[in-house]
């Protein structure tokens, strides 16, 4: 009984289509595969950024796989052929591994790359990224930002740079159609007549860096002799009400400070008849139902009520 063997895939390679970190892993079938014509051959693919503790593992019948990587580091991958037990009248047969690596040859020393990169998606509408120039770079150094997300044919360069002393230190992005809930890739590279500049790569999802506008139209309503309802409206813009969390700060008579986090646009406050002044501010953040992370808005304008009327009817300001 001859032992069944299968070859590893051929020409296993990592292809960079120029999408700033979204790479293609592709391979050709093993030689002599048609011995197993009646059988569905599978491939087990393992890949990771160099330095990562864990491999991502995929089992596929295809000859390619696509995923995002951190191009600041190298990438390593390996693949082998799997013959399921149905094909071999016994146990699963695996080929040896085919291995490959990919990295972008770094130019310049690490200190020349941009520092303190910060990107904020204001009100889920306007993306703005800012950075500081690399350490010790001369004023002739200029940085350029490129970005890509699935849906764009190719990486695009920023067309509206924020400048300081003639240097690009940020980018105001145009309207980004259908760009949330997918990886957004950025490369900031640079040029200088003096020395080579190290490129930096960043990946995030836009819904996770949203900074909403603060809530508006803060009002008071007396619910009962000992309860006041605080109300506000969601900020203007595209973010739906179901996506907000709120933080409230309430001050009674310049002494008591109450802070609370709520999911709705109301908060009921227990008060005493002795309360003479009530002030509150609210800020908003995108909640866990709509993103994995977010940035608190600025605080709203303060809304206060003082005087005898606090114990009466509806209070509006």
């Amino acid at each position: 009984d001859t032992e069944i063997k299968v070859n590893p895939p051929q020409d296993f390679e990592i292809v960079d289509p120029g999408y700033l970190g979204y790479l293609y892993l592709q391979w050709q079938p093993p030689l002599s595969l048609d011995h197993f014509k009646e059988c569905t051959v599978e491939y087990e693919l393992k890949y990771r950024n160099i330095g990562s503790e864990t491999w991502k593992t995929i089992i596929t019948k295809n000859l390619h796989y696509k995923d995002g990587f951190d191009l600041n580091k190298g990438i390593e991958a390996k693949i082998h052929t799997l013959l399921p037990w149905q094909c071999t009248n016994g146990s699963e047969v695996q080929s040896s591994w085919a291995e490959t690596t990919y990295w972008i040859s770094p130019q310049g020393i690490p200190e020349t790359k941009v520092q303190d990169m910060d990107c904020v998606y204001y009100n889920w509408q306007y993306l703005l990224c800012s950075w500081k120039p690399g350490i010790g770079v001369l004023l002739d150094t200029n940085y350029n930002l490129f970005y890509w997300y699935e849906g764009l044919d190719h990486a695009l360069q920023c067309v509206d740079y924020i400048k300081a002393d003639g240097q690009n230190i940020g980018c105001r992005f145009p309207y980004l159609e259908a760009s949330d809930y997918k990886d957004f890739y950025i490369c900031v590279n640079g040029s200088s007549e003096n020395k080579p500049i190290r490129s930096s790569y960043f990946t995030f999802q836009l819904q996770n860096i949203v900074k909403p506008l603060p809530p508006v139209y803060l009002t008071f309503t007396r619910e009962s002799s000992c309860e006041i309802k605080l109300k506000w409206s969601i900020p203007l813009g595209p973010i739906p009400a179901r996506c907000f969390d709120y933080e409230i700060e309430i001050r009674e008579d310049d002494t008591t400070l109450v802070t609370a986090t709520v999911e709705n646009e109301t908060y009921t406050l227990k008060t005493t008849n002795e309360t003479r002044q009530l002030c509150f501010v609210v800020r908003s953040k995108v909640n866990i139902y709509c993103s994995d992370d977010g940035i608190w808005s600025e605080w709203s304008d303060k809304q206060c009520w003082e005087g005898e009327d606090l114990s009466k009817k509806t209070l509006l300001r």
Epitope: Q10, D11, E13, I14, V15, P17, Y24, Q26, Q28, P29, L31, S32, L33, D34, H35, L63, H64, T100
Partner: antibody, heavy 118, light 107 residues
Framework: EVKLVESGGGLVKPGGSLKLSCAAS????????MSWVRQTPEKRLEWVAT????????YYPDSVKGRFTISRDNAKNNLYLQMSSLRSEDTALYYC???????????WGQGTSVTVSS | DIVMTQSQKFMSTSVGDRVSVTCRAS??????VAWYQQKPGQSPKSLIY???YRYSGVPDRFTGSGSGTDFTLTISNVQSEDLAEYFC?????????FGGGTKLEIR
């Protein structure tokens, strides 16, 4: 429909250089390995070079290694063969061929003629 | 290098006949053999891969067989348009090598 169109052939002196191109259409170019094969005046077929879909792997016979370079531009769907230090025995009709998923060649261009003569 | 030998340079046949073109490899190439057809004045056309599998669009009168070192391309019910030269090729290992070709003549 898969289409491969070679160009760039011509008459060149021994020791000279020439760059052949192959424009591909009708398939996802970057997913396929590509080869150059030549046919000598005696009608023998000779494999010249192969490149993988992403361009990471290149293969040559000893007869052209160090003189010929195969490359590709996946953004333009173009395959190239840079030939230098040409010899009279390089005279042939040069075909561009797509490598199928079993490493055979499943589609061929119409060829471009290269003549090396003083 | 693996040498692919097509011992018959020419073969003569008649329309409707059955003809077999043979190819021998100098070492084991498993089933990693392809066959190509080249009609006069045209570029080669792919017929068979993996020794016995027809490319789509290839008439079923073309049949490939063999493994290891001996391979055969059989054309049953030969048609006048089969007038061509037939080449075998191994792709089991680099360098890829072709047979010298067998010219089929129709009587």
């Amino acid at each position: 429909e898969v289409k491969l169109v070679e160009s760039g052939g011509g008459l060149v002196k021994p020791g000279g250089s020439l760059k052949l191109s192959c424009a591909a259409s009708g398939f996802t170019f970057s997913s396929y390995g590509m080869s150059w094969v030549r046919q000598t005046p005696e009608k023998r077929l000779e494999w010249v070079a192969t490149i993988s879909g992403g361009g990471s792997y290149t293969y040559y016979p000893d007869s052209v290694k160090g003189r010929f370079t195969i490359s590709r531009d996946n953004a333009k769907n173009n395959l190239y063969l840079q030939m230098s230090s040409l010899r009279s025995e390089d005279t042939a009709l040069y075909y561009c061929a797509r490598r199928d998923l079993r490493s055979a060649m499943d589609h061929w261009g119409q060829g471009t003629s290269v003549t090396v003569s003083s | 290098d693996i040498v692919m030998t097509q011992s018959q340079k020419f073969m003569s046949t008649s329309v409707g006949d059955r003809v077999s073109v043979t190819c021998r490899a100098s070492q084991n190439v498993d089933i990693n053999v392809a066959w190509y057809q080249q009609k006069p004045g045209q570029s080669p056309k792919s017929l068979i891969y993996s020794a016995s599998y027809r490319y789509s669009g290839v008439p079923d009168r073309f049949t490939g067989s063999g493994s290891g070192t001996d391979f055969t391309l059989t054309i049953s019910n030969v048609q006048s348009e089969d007038l061509a030269e037939y080449f075998c090729q191994q792709y089991n290992s680099y360098p890829l090598t072709f047979g010298g070709g067998t010219k089929l003549e129709i009587r």
